[in-house]
């Protein structure tokens, strides 16, 4: 038998859950890393205390063809209130240092874990 009954759409994910899911994905990336992440691609370092979510996306979106971070890129696009395209940098984004994607992910993960522990879900 095929059930064609409609389902109520799931409610919006609470910020705390959304943050936890992003942390879990970043943990997954760091734990499953065998070869250099994204072939050692370099991205702009960001200020983790200033408009972090959009800045992180603006940096990572410039990495293409790296399946390991595609889910992270998708998740971050939902964390940013404006649409981010490759090559776009907001005024919150200071472009002075490039680091490897693997280091970027580790730094972001550490900071998000700290926010989660402190209950800063906004």
């Amino acid at each position: 038998l095929t059930c064609l009954g409609g389902f109520a759409s799931p409610g919006p994910v609470p910020p705390s859950t959304a943050l936890r899911e992003l942390i879990e994905e970043l943990v997954n990336i760091t734990q499953n890393q065998k070869a250099p992440l994204c072939n050692g691609s370099m991205v702009w370092s960001i200020n983790l205390t200033a408009g972090m979510y959009c800045a992180a996306l603006e940096s990572l979106i410039n990495v293409s063809g790296c399946s390991a971070i595609e889910k992270t890129q998708r998740m971050l696009s939902g964390f940013c209130p404006h649409k981010v395209s490759a090559g776009q940098f907001s005024s919150l984004h200071v472009r002075d240092t490039k680091i490897e994607v693997a280091q970027f992910v580790k730094d972001l993960l550490l900071h998000l874990k700290k926010l989660f522990r402190e209950g800063q879900f906004n």
């Epitope: 910020p15 959304a18 200033a50 696009s77 964390f79 209130p81 404006h82 005024s91 209950g119 879900f121």
Partner: antibody, heavy 118, light 109 residues
């Protein structure tokens, strides 16, 4: 010149569904998130949700998630907001607005008044 | 869900200074809340004044400035003009949705 032109006022009965359109010009809709905001008479602003017209991905406010549907047609540069199971407290002006970093919510539609009355 | 609170009303003298605040029930407001401030006059659509905490929209007069102040987003109006009399709203981003503030009615008297 950037413009967001919304469809006209509606008077509907409780339980009905309303569909409001927001036709944009002066930019390509797929390059921006489009947000929708409700304002009941004499009340404040309430964010309803947003859509990425390029892929249809949506985010909804908890209050509206089970009754609102946001869609967009990139071929006509038009965003749509559908609100179902209308009740009297849905009587409000509904705004579409373009959001981008270099001037978030900078451009707003003129608003569409929806009156729900039996 | 978070609640975003503003002063219900404030009065400022012409040429005077007034600061409106935007408080989050979940804790300190940060730059990751991408605070926006809007001005709305009766019968008109809202108009963006400040975005991303402290960036002025191209049409926003220099007398308006945005900042973070004591864990809240703040809008300071220095040198108030009669035309600044309006309702002011803030909006904060909470990871995946916006919440508007309750609004502040500013009277220039």
């Amino acid at each position: 010149e950037v413009q967001l032109v919304q469809s006209g006022a509606e008077v509907l009965k409780p339980g009905a569904t309303v569909l409001i359109s927001c036709k944009v010009s002066g930019f390509t809709i797929k390059d921006y998130y489009m947000h929708w905001v409700q304002q009941a008479p004499g009340k404040g602003l309430e964010w309803m949700g947003r859509i990425d017209p390029e892929d249809g991905e949506t985010k909804y406010a908890p209050k509206f998630h089970d009754r609102v549907t946001l869609t967009a047609d990139t071929s006509t540069d038009t965003a749509y907001m559908e609100l179902s199971s209308l009740r009297s407290e849905d009587t409000a002006v509904y705004y579409c607005t373009r959001y981008d970093y270099y001037g978030p919510f900078a451009y707003w539609g003129q608003g569409t008044l929806v009156t729900v009355s039996s | 869900q978070a609640v975003v609170t503003q002063e219900p009303s404030l009065t400022v003298s012409p040429g005077g200074t007034v600061t409106l605040t935007c408080r989050s029930s979940t804790g300190a407001v940060t730059t990751s809340n991408y605070a926006n401030w809007f001005q709305q006059k009766p019968g008109q659509a809202p108009r963006t004044l400040i975005y991303g905490t402290n960036n002025r929209a191209p049409w926003t007069p220099a007398r308006f400035s945005g900042s973070l102040l004591g864990g809240k987003a703040a809008l300071t109006l220095s040198g108030a003009q009669p035309e600044d009399e309006a309702e002011y709203y803030c909006a904060l981003w909470y990871i995946n949705h916006f919440i508007f503030g309750t609004g502040t009615k500013v009277t220039v008297l």
